[in-house]
């Protein structure tokens, strides 16, 4: 019939697709590290760059005092590669500094702090031996994964030796997160 | 010690191209993020743009139809071209570094006034 | 565009006072606040970064604090050579933007 509209009979509700650029999404690069306070019992965290170069962030999701934000509840992936150089000459005082039963390593952790929780949780850790590599190394590690993570959680990113860290090019050290 | 020296013409005359150069010695250009900023004479401070080792680029809103930041990695040198000036672009210009935002202007050039007349 | 308003524009004191000089940004910047130091005729002179972060070099009469929108530049006990102008400038986002200078006078 002419006009006539006819409704299916199992009637479904979509929600309407979210444009991926709305969604909180960051990446943020490596920049010179000022020497820092840290607990005891944690590496010390990174400083970043926010808004230079490649670093961006984007709808809400903010980066201040060594965390990122997350501005709403959801699945995000979060990354990070940290690239560390230094000499074979370094490793003896890598062991003196404060680890003398570890091997000579080099330690990235991604770390969620949680308001209502009391203690930071890791997420994500890399580890790699360096002593045994050439007299000038560079070692990247690489970390990514997808998370759960609820509005107001905070994200930072944790390393063994922060004066190891190269921080000489944006696209060797970074970090960030986006929802999905 | 890280240095930067501003260079180029003093006087340009109304609706041409003013073009500066700033040299940096005592250190690499690569890693860091160098501006130019300019003051009028007796006003405030004006940040122009800056430009990035790899050649990326970001201007003021203000003046981005007339701007123009290069790098030349090789001389470790960075250039300004401002194109169209009027006499309100009189003003000294210095060069500066900045080594992340976290951290602010930490090495300026002396400054080069130019002066925009006919 | 960050609007960063400087008071007071000009201030007079003699050697060996503390001054206090504001710096308020039209949002919050969280800690990216800078302070220069321009002597006539030369280039300003970065003396805190990060709002309250002394430059190398720099003497520790001057100090920073403040965070998110209101931020103040102390000078604890003044020297002849610290007469000059003094200038905020945000670094929180592009386009960087400067607040139009306090003016320290002898008295």
């Known amino acids: 019939l002419k006009g006539q509209e006819f409704a299916p009979s199992h009637q479904q509700v979509y929600a309407p697709l979210r444009a991926d650029g709305d969604k909180p999404r960051a990446h943020l690069t490596v920049v010179r590290q000022t020497p820092t306070q840290h607990f005891k019992n944690q590496f010390p965290a990174l400083h970043w760059e926010h808004e230079l170069g490649l670093a961006f962030t984007k709808n809400r999701m903010n980066y201040t005092n060594k965390f990122l934000l997350i501005p709403e509840s959801g699945d995000y992936f979060i990354y990070s590669q940290v690239t560390f150089r230094g000499m074979t000459s370094e490793c003896s005082e890598i062991r003196q500094a404060g680890r003398p039963n570890k091997p000579d390593s080099i330690t990235v952790v991604i770390t969620k702090v949680t308001d209502s929780y009391p203690e930071p949780t890791q997420l994500l850790m890399g580890t790699k031996s360096v002593c045994e590599v050439g007299s000038n190394w560079f070692q990247p590690i690489y970390l990514g994964a997808m998370f759960s993570l609820q509005e107001g959680d905070k994200l930072m990113v944790n390393v063994s030796d922060i004066s190891l860290v190269d921080y000489t090019k944006e696209d060797k050290t970074f970090f960030g997160a986006f929802l999905l | 010690q890280v240095q930067l020296q501003e260079s180029g013409p003093g006087l340009v005359k109304p609706s041409e191209t003013l073009s500066l150069t700033c040299t940096v010695s005592?250190?690499?250009?690569?890693?860091?993020?160098w501006s130019w900023i300019r003051q009028p004479p007796g006003k405030c401070l004006e940040w122009i743009g800056y430009?990035?080792?790899?050649?990326?680029?970001k201007y003021n809103p203000s003046l981005k139809s007339r701007v123009t930041i290069s790098i030349d990695t090789s001389k470790n040198q960075f250039s300004l071209k401002l194109s169209s000036v009027t006499a309100a672009d009189t003003a000294v210009y210095y060069c500066?570094?900045?080594?992340?935002?976290?951290?602010?202007?930490?090495?300026w050039g002396q400054g080069t006034l130019v002066t925009v007349s006919s | 565009d960050i609007q960063m308003t400087q008071s007071p524009s000009s201030l007079s004191a003699s050697v060996g006072d503390r001054v206090t000089i504001t710096c308020r940004a039209s949002?919050?910047?969280?800690?990216?606040l800078n302070w220069y130091q321009q002597r006539p005729g030369k280039a300003p002179k970065l003396l805190i970064y990060?709002?309250?972060s002394l430059q190398s070099g720099v003497p520790s009469r001057f100090s920073g604090s403040g965070s998110g929108t209101d931020f103040t530049l102390t000078i604890s006990s003044l020297q002849p050579e610290d007469f000059a102008t003094y200038y905020c400038?945000?670094?929180?986002?592009?386009?960087?933007?400067f607040g139009c200078g306090t003016k320290l006078e002898i008295k």
């Open positions: 500066a570094r900045e080594t992340g935002s976290y951290y602010g202007f930490d090495y």
């Open positions: 005592g250190g690499s250009i690569s890693s860091y993020f």
């Open positions: 430009i990035y080792y790899s050649g990326q680029t």
């Open positions: 949002q919050s910047i969280n800690n990216y």
């Open positions: 990060a709002a309250s």
């Open positions: 400038q945000q670094s929180y986002s592009t386009p960087r933007t």
